[in-house]
Each structure stands twice: as structure tokens, then as C-alpha cells.
């Protein structure tokens, strides 16, 4: 029957005896940087062109015997997972292979760089349709490898990489840590993170999503009709490269930002058991398992948003953390989070002509994270309106006063070390949705956007008794753009968006006591674009 | 995902002198940096990627590489330019002694230098 991994990524309407979704990536070329491959394997023959590129180090050990089938093992399997006739994701995609890993599966950063340069030069010499580059490899953090990936991505190439098999933070590895690359962790048939011996899949904020990566049947280089099961984040990345090829074949004009947002949007949500990840990484790791979209027609009418976490600020008093959106994305809101609860909020600020989200640590704090809500909003014009601390008992408030601008997010930032929990909670006056309200000692920042057909509304969920977590979600057809807490008191650890749900975390209930100050309200700003919906209907 | 002030080992070598009478001395106050893999067993000392500033042309990259070879030779060191990058990043790959790093960091147009390291199939 259909291999479990193909079934997992396939929407029910495609599930048949033969997994053959329409438009199997035929307009897309996938470059594979890996070991040598057995291109005459029945699973991939005629689909993979072996380029003359080879840049590999000598094999270790004097007694190493080069055995063709072993040299080709990793690359052949991955080529099969991407485009194989029977066990492949994008059965119509054509591939080109570059050899950057030796017979022991080892390569160098420099060899990989030269390979990426080769792809760029090939693209310039003979421009074709959309390009996907699969990098099923990992090394230590490398500034130069990340920079090369960034340049290639900005030239319109989609790069997909393995998160790494070190059961560690993916941000410590390259190219997994490159923001422009789509970084993929591995899950198994039970949707659990993959364990590989004593190690396993990497995790953390540098992972974009997970995909099947355990017991994946694919072409074996032992013979031209041999198949074998392999496991790893390479296999997971190959699934996403295949899905990307399918999506790009259906919509060749998709940008990297649009593709990444769609990959996230169509993923299965909240199916991974997060207990497998270290506690401090759970909130940072996306609970997403990749899947094909249910239709090959674009979902262009939707307002897509994703959450981007910054690196940890570190514990020094004036430490800050910055979260950035991709070049084609709009920063629609900014929030912050600190495990100790000691933070001085967050603000949106311009940096290099683009808005970024900056979170501020507080004295005695162990550090903060900035959390950006990054959205695809064509023709958007966004600005930040700030109100300084009001010092009045009513608290600080700011609204979007420009005609046609709507509120997409609220941030608050304070200079004092402790806002003090003994101030009465500030409540938003009803009937004023276009307004941010915060503590009187905080400055408040409103993200105000104008875009064709953009409409937003505020949704709140308050709990009178103290709780560790309060959530509020946007309903079907609406997208979460902003997530914040009312009031901005110090027992709130922070707020962040998980898919379409706004999560506000508070200190452990046992330490706050069940006084009225324990009340926490989660505030979600939910938006939709009627303009995008109309445009989509006109196309159909 | 990871900012450039990320989690890796960085060795900053300040530009202190104008030795070798460089014709194109680096802009005042800029400091080229040296990076290497934080995971020691994965390091490949002896091979370095010299990354030049963004707008550097291929001819300047080649000139900078030749200059490094000439200055190294004057100090009795053999170097080998393995590859000149252009198309994605300006720069070059050089096989040389780590003793020459301080010299290389003072070359014109140099943004940073990274020691080569291993990558692995996942």
C-alpha cells in the first residue's frame, strides 16, 4: 500500500491506490547537493541529470574502500523521495545532482559554497522555471554558508535544508540557521519527533516545520530496483522540497515568502508531542508537520501570517532581542516573552528601512525573546503610532488616526524595572477597537496598516482567576495578526501567537496568589483581506 | 532564524598597523573578523574562505588574492588560491598557514574570513 509518509503529506482527496496528485512538479527543477547518485535506478531514471560538479574531501582512513553502491546511497534515496516514480513526492519534477559529499557522507563548507555558486551561474546562463535547492546536510554554524544561502534565496531560488540530526538547537548549525532557508525537522509515523540512536531531530526557532523522516522507503543504490528505508532530517527536507516543487508547479510565480507561508498554512498543526523537546525549546519549536495543499489552485485570497522568534537576548540588564520578518513580509505586530517575567516590554522600530520587533530585558531578568508576527499583505502601508507613558490613572492609549488605517497589533514598552502589580487592571473602553491600551507607566505602540480591503477586529478573552495560560483564537476566515496581554503587569511572562491562537503566559499560579491582580486578558487582533478574496474569485 | 550576531565562535583581529604599505588601505575604523566552527572536530584549519565586501568586483577579488600570496611569500609562506568566488559572494578560497590570518584580515575589501569546516549528510 502507499508508504505511510506519502499518505501523511497527502490531503484525503488525493488518496488513492496510486499516489499521483496532479501537476507533479513538472515545471520545477530541483537541485540536490549530496553524494553521488545512481541515476539509472528505475525509480529516478530519466528524471535526474547528474551534473559534472564535484567538490568533495578525501575519505578518512587509509583502509577505506570506495564501493559505488555505498557512495551513492544517501543521494539516491533522497532523489527518490523528491521525485521517484513510486515513492516520490513530486513525481513530475526533474532534478540535477551536484556531488558535495564523499562516500562517507562528508563534505566541506567551501565545497558547498562552490556548489551553490555553480547553481547561481547555471541559473544566469540558462534561466528556467522555478528552482528548488535541497541541502540535506549540516555543519556547525557558518556565517559564510548562511550568507551564500541568503544571496541565492534573494535571487529567487527556494532553498530547503535538513534541520540536523543532533537532537540540538538547529540555530547552532548551518545551513539550518540561515533565515532565508526553509529548515525541516523530522517526525515519524506517530507524528513524534524522530529519535536517531542516542540523538534525533534538531528543534528550536530555526526550524520552520517538520516532515516525515523515519522509516522512509526510497530508492536504494544496491541495485536498480532495490528499495530501502532510511531515516533523518534529510528525508524530511526531501519531502518539503517535493511539496515545494508541487506548489511552485501549480503557482510558478510564488515568491519564497509566499511559499514558506503556504507550507506553514497547509501543515498539520499541533500533532507533535512537544514533551520530546527540551522544556526551554518547546515554545520556540513549531508544531507543524508538512502537507500538500488540498488543491493545486492557489490560496491567494488568504491573509497568511507566521510567527518569528528572535534569538535569546541574554541576561544583561540592557540586553535586547530582535525579530525580523523576511523582505517580502510585513511586520504586523510585535510581542515579547521572558521565562522569568522580568522584561521591559517590546517596541516596533525602523531598521534599514524596515520595521523590526525589539524586546527589552529587565534588571535581574534571565533574558527575553522578541516575537514578530510576519504577514503577506500586498500593497500594504504600515506605520507605528506611539503614545508615551500617560502617568494618568486611565493608563496609556494610542489609536490609528489616519483615514483607512486599521489596527493590526499593539506593543508596550516601559523603562521602569517593575510596572507594579498593585495598580488596578486597565480595561479597554468598549466600542473602541482601533485603540491600544496599556499601563500608565508604559509607552504604547500601535501598528496601523492600510491595505486594499483590509479589515481587522479585536477579540479578548479574560480570566478573573490567575491561570498559567490564557488563549484566544481567531475564527475561520480570519487571521491572527496581533497578540498581547491586558494589563501589562509584571506577572505576565509575555504573549505570542501560535498559528491562529494568541497565547498569554503568566507566572506559576502558586506564586501569584489568587487576588484580583491575577486577572489576565489575552487580546487578539484578527484580520482578513476582502481585496485578496475578491481577486481570487475573479481569477476563478 | 539566526542573526549574524549568532551562536558561533568569533575572533576579532583589529587592524592596528599599515604595514606592507597597502595601496588600498581598508576604510578607517572597520575591522575584519575571523570566524571558525565552534565544534572543534569539524574544523579544517589550513583552508580559509576570505569574504570580501559586497560590491567587490571579480578583478578586485583576484587582485586581493594575488596580494595575499605576494605578502605571504615575502614572509616565506606558501599559499594556494583554490577558488575565486563570484556570482554569489565575492571572495576566494585559500590554502595557507593560520599564521597569515592577521595579515589577511588587513587586506583591502576584506569583510571577514572563515576557516573551512566539515558538513555531513543528515
Amino acid at each position: 500500500s502507499i508508504p505511510w509518509n506519502l499518505e501523511r503529506i497527502t490531503p484525503p482527496r488525493y488518496r488513492a491506490d496510486e499516489y499521483q496528485p496532479p501537476d507533479g512538479g513538472s515545471l520545477v527543477e530541483v537541485y540536490l547537493l549530496d553524494t553521488s547518485i545512481q541515476s539509472d535506478h528505475r525509480e529516478i531514471e530519466g528524471r535526474v541529470m547528474v551534473t559534472d560538479f564535484e567538490n568533495v574531501p578525501e575519505e578518512d582512513g587509509t583502509r577505506f574502500h570506495r564501493q559505488a553502491s555505498k557512495c551513492d546511497s544517501h543521494g539516491t534515496h533522497l532523489a527518490g523521495v523528491v521525485s521517484g516514480r513510486d515513492a516520490g513526492v513530486a513525481k513530475g519534477a526533474s532534478m540535477r545532482s551536484l556531488r558535495v559529499l564523499n562516500c562517507q557522507g562528508k563534505g566541506t563548507v567551501s565545497g558547498t559554497l562552490i556548489g551553490l555558486e555553480f547553481i547561481r551561474k547555471s541559473q544566469l546562463v540558462q534561466p528556467v522555471g522555478p528552482l528548488v535547492v535541497l541541502l540535506p546536510l549540516a555543519g556547525g554554524y557558518s556565517r559564510v554558508l548562511n550568507a551564500a544561502c541568503q544571496r541565492l534565496a534573494r535571487a529567487g531560488v527556494v532553498l530547503v535544508t535538513a534541520a540536523g540530526n543532533f537532537r540540538d538547537d538547529a540555530c547552532l548549525y548551518s545551513p539550518a540557521s540561515a533565515p532565508e532557508v526553509i529548515t525541516v525537522g523530522a517526525t515519524n509515523a506517530q507524528d513524534q519527533p524522530v529519535t536517531l540512536g542516542t540523538l534525533g531531530t534538531n528543534f528550536g526557532r530555526c526550524v520552520d516545520l517538520f516532515a516525515p523522516g523515519e522509516d522512509i522507503i526510497g530508492a536504494s543504490s544496491d541495485c536498480s530496483t532495490c528499495f530501502v528505508s532510511q531515516s533523518g532530517t534529510s528525508q524530511a527536507a526531501a519531502h518539503v522540497a517535493g511539496i515545494a516543487a508541487m506548489m511552485l508547479s501549480a503557482e510558478p510565480e510564488l515568491t519564497l515568502a509566499e511559499l514558506r507561508q503556504r507550507l506553514i498554512h497547509f501543515s498539520a498543526k499541533d500533532v507533535i508531542n512537544e514533551a520530546w523537546f527540551p522544556e526551554d525549546q518547546r515554545v520556540l519549536t513549531p508544531n507543524l508537520v508538512a502537507a500538500l495543499p488540498p488543491s493545486t489552485h492557489g490560496a491567494g485570497w488568504q491573509l497568511f501570517c507566521r510567527t518569528v522568534w528572535s534569538a535569546h537576548s541574554g541576561p544583561t540588564r540592557m540586553a535586547t532581542a530582535v525579530a525580523r520578518c523576511a523582505p517580502d513580509e510585513e511586520l504586523l505586530s510585535c510581542s515579547s516573552f521572558s521565562r522569568s517575567g522580568k522584561r521591559r516590554g517590546e517596541r516596533m522600530e525602523a531598521q534599514g528601512g524596515k520595521l523590526v520587533c525589539r524586546a527589552h530585558n529587565a534588571f535581574g531578568g534571565e533574558g527575553v525573546y522578541a516575537i514578530a508576527r510576519c504577514c503577506l499583505l500586498p500593497q500594504a502601508n504600515c506605520s507605528v503610532h506611539t503614545a508615551p507613558p500617560a502617568e494618568a490613572s486611565m493608563g496609556t492609549r494610542v489609536h490609528c488616526h489616519q483615514q483607512g488605517h486599521v489596527l493590526t497589533g499593539c506593543s508596550s514598552h516601559w523603562e521602569v524595572e517593575d510596572l507594579g502589580t498593585h495598580k488596578p487592571p486597565v480595561l479597554r473602553p468598549r466600542g473602541q477597537p482601533n485603540q491600544c491600551v496599556g499601563h500608565r507607566e508604559a509607552s504604547i505602540h500601535a501598528s496601523c496598516c492600510h491595505a486594499p480591503g483590509l479589515e481587522c477586529k479585536v477579540k479578548e478573552h479574560g480570566i478573573p482567576a490567575p491561570q498559567e495560560q490564557v488563549t484566544v483564537a481567531c475564527e475561520e476566515g480570519w487571521t491572527l495578526t496581533g497578540c498581547s496581554a491586558l494589563p501589562g503587569t509584571s506577572h505576565v511572562l509575555g504573549a505570542y501567537a501560535v498559528d491562529n491562537t494568541c497565547v498569554v503566559r503568566s507566572r506559576d499560579v502558586s506564586t501569584t496568589g489568587s487576588t484580583s491582580e491575577g486577572a489576565v486578558t489575552a487580546v487578539a487582533i484578527c484580520c482578513r483581506s476582502r481585496h485578496l478574496a475578491q481577486a481570487s474569485q475573479e481569477l476563478q | 532564524q539566526e542573526d549574524e550576531d549568532g551562536d558561533y565562535e568569533e575572533l576579532v583581529l583589529a587592524l592596528r598597523s599599515e604595514e606592507d604599505g597597502l595601496a588600498e588601505a581598508p576604510e578607517h575604523g572597520t575591522t575584519a573578523t575571523f570566524h571558525r566552527c565552534a565544534k572543534d572536530p569539524w574544523r579544517l584549519p589550513g583552508t580559509y574562505v576570505v569574504v570580501l565586501k559586497e560590491e567587490t568586483h571579480l578583478s578586485q577579488s583576484e587582485r586581493t588574492a594575488r596580494r595575499l600570496q605576494a605578502q605571504a611569500a615575502r614572509r616565506g609562506y606558501l599559499t594556494k588560491i583554490l577558488h575565486v568566488f563570484h556570482g554569489l559572494l565575492p571572495g576566494f578560497l585559500v590554502k595557507m598557514s593560520g599564521d597569515l590570518l592577521e595579515l589577511a584580515l588587513k587586506l583591502p575589501h576584506v569583510d571577514y574570513i572563515e576557516e573551512d569546516s566539515s558538513v555531513f549528510a543528515q
Epitope: E18, G46, G84, D86, D222, C223, T225, F227 | -
Partner: antibody
Framework: QVQLQQPGAELVKPGASVKLSCKAS????????MHWVKQRPGQGLEWIGE????????NYNEKFKSKATLTVDKSSSTAYMQLSSLTSEDSAVYYC???????????WGQGTSVTVSS | DIVMTQSHKFMSTSVGDRVSITCKAS??????VAWYQQKPGQSPKLLIY???YRYTGVPDRFTGSGSGTDFTFTISSVQAEDLAVYYC?????????FGGGTKLEIK
């Protein structure tokens, strides 16, 4: 659905030739290799050879190299096997079977019974 | 050529019994082995591919195992309709070769 249609029977004289057909439908004919298998009455299965319909590439069992010739007609999605210089030893049921890389010979024709008799 | 040997030409069993058919390759064939069922007067039908994977629609009482040179096909609880000849086949190299077949007879 996938189908491989073969004529039911062929009666041929010793020394003559016969061209067996196998018409494929329900899938992309050029995507998968086509195999031919012989089965004599009461005996086991014997592999004759295979052909790649997309480029006409063939592989034969040495034993059948001078006996069988495999061809395809892409326009009609039909595979052919010509058997020459027939003797009574060639009397058998001949099956065509589609082979997928992973799933092996997953669809078989009903077989053509060839009888060599004067 | 790789020779595939099915040691039993016939096996007699009763409904509900567990039965295992073995197949030995003359050289390492990795997991490139398929098992087919042929009922009287019918074409062969694929049951198992890649030594251990059950093909679409095949009841789960049929299982396959093995790699290298030794392979086993098992029916966990024989049904009357399982009366047939079972063949193993190696797909490791050309010429493809089949085992001689094992005829399963129901007592």
C-alpha cells in the same frame, strides 16, 4: 483503472513466428517497464525479458535472446513480443506484466495461450 | 544468474493454521524480493514487494520477511481461498528469476 489486454489464444505452426500484443490502459504507458513471462502447462514462471516503453531499451534472459523480440508502439500504448522459429517447446501461456520500481510486477495481463502444432 | 530456491514444492495445511514458505537466493539480493500468488487458471497476483511490504488490498494475514539470501512468506491463518501456488522472485538483477513455486494444499 490499470488494464493489460492480451488476446486469449494463438495457434501457430512449427517454424513460424507469432507476434503477441499487450495493450495497456489506465496509466501512462511510458512511465513503467513492461515484462514478459512464460509459463508452460503445470510449470513455474520463467522471465523472458523487459522493455522500457519510453525509449525502447530492452533486457533479455540469455535463454530467450534468439527467440523473443520485444517492441512497443507508444501511439497505441501497446507492447509486443515476437516469437520466432516456434517449436512445441514454445507452447505455453505468455504473460505481459507492468513493473513499477517499488511495487514489482503489480499488474499482469490475462495471458495468451500459444499452441505450436502442425 | 541468481537462482531462487523454494525448498518445498508442496505444502499441506489446514484452515486456520500458520504456514511459512521459504525462499533462498544463490547470492545477496538485498531486499529486492517479491512474492506472488497464482490461483488455478489465473494470472499471478502481487502480494509482497521489497521483501516485507504488503501490496495494496492484500489481507494482513500475509507477511514477508528477510534480506540478503533468506526470505520467508507467511500466512498467519490460512483460509480456504488461499489455495494457490506461491512464487518468490528476485528483482536484484537481470535476468529476473522466480523460485520454482510452492503449491499450498488445504487438507
Amino acid at each position: 483503472q490499470v488494464q493489460l489486454q492480451q488476446p486469449g489464444a494463438e495457434l501457430v505452426k512449427p517454424g513460424a513466428s507469432v507476434k503477441l500484443s499487450c495493450k495497456a490502459s489506465g496509466y501512462t504507458f511510458t512511465s513503467y517497464w513492461m515484462h514478459w513471462v512464460k509459463q508452460r502447462p503445470g510449470q513455474g514462471l520463467e522471465w523472458i525479458g523487459e522493455i522500457n516503453p519510453s525509449n525502447g531499451r530492452t533486457n533479455y534472459n540469455e535463454k530467450f535472446k534468439s527467440k523473443a523480440t520485444l517492441t512497443v508502439d507508444k501511439s497505441s500504448s501497446t507492447a509486443y513480443m515476437q516469437l520466432s522459429s516456434l517449436t512445441s517447446e514454445d507452447s505455453a501461456v505468455y504473460y505481459c506484466a507492468r513493473e513499477r520500481p517499488l511495487y514489482a510486477m503489480d499488474y499482469w495481463g490475462q495471458g495468451t495461450s500459444v499452441t505450436v502444432s502442425s | 544468474d541468481i537462482v531462487m530456491t523454494q525448498s518445498h514444492k508442496f505444502m499441506s495445511t489446514s484452515v486456520g493454521d500458520r504456514v511459512s514458505i521459504t525462499c533462498k537466493a544463490s547470492q545477496d539480493v538485498s531486499t529486492a524480493v517479491a512474492w506472488y500468488q497464482q490461483k488455478p487458471g489465473q494470472s499471478p497476483k502481487l502480494l509482497i514487494y521489497s521483501a516485507s511490504y504488503r501490496y495494496t488490498g492484500v489481507p494482513d494475514r500475509f507477511t514477508g520477511s528477510g534480506s540478503g539470501t533468506d526470505f520467508t512468506f507467511t500466512i498467519s491463518s490460512v483460509q480456504a481461498e488461499d489455495l494457490a501456488v506461491y512464487y518468490c522472485q528476485q528483482r536484484y538483477s537481470t535476468p529476473r528469476t522466480f523460485g520454482g513455486g510452492t503449491k499450498l494444499e488445504i487438507k
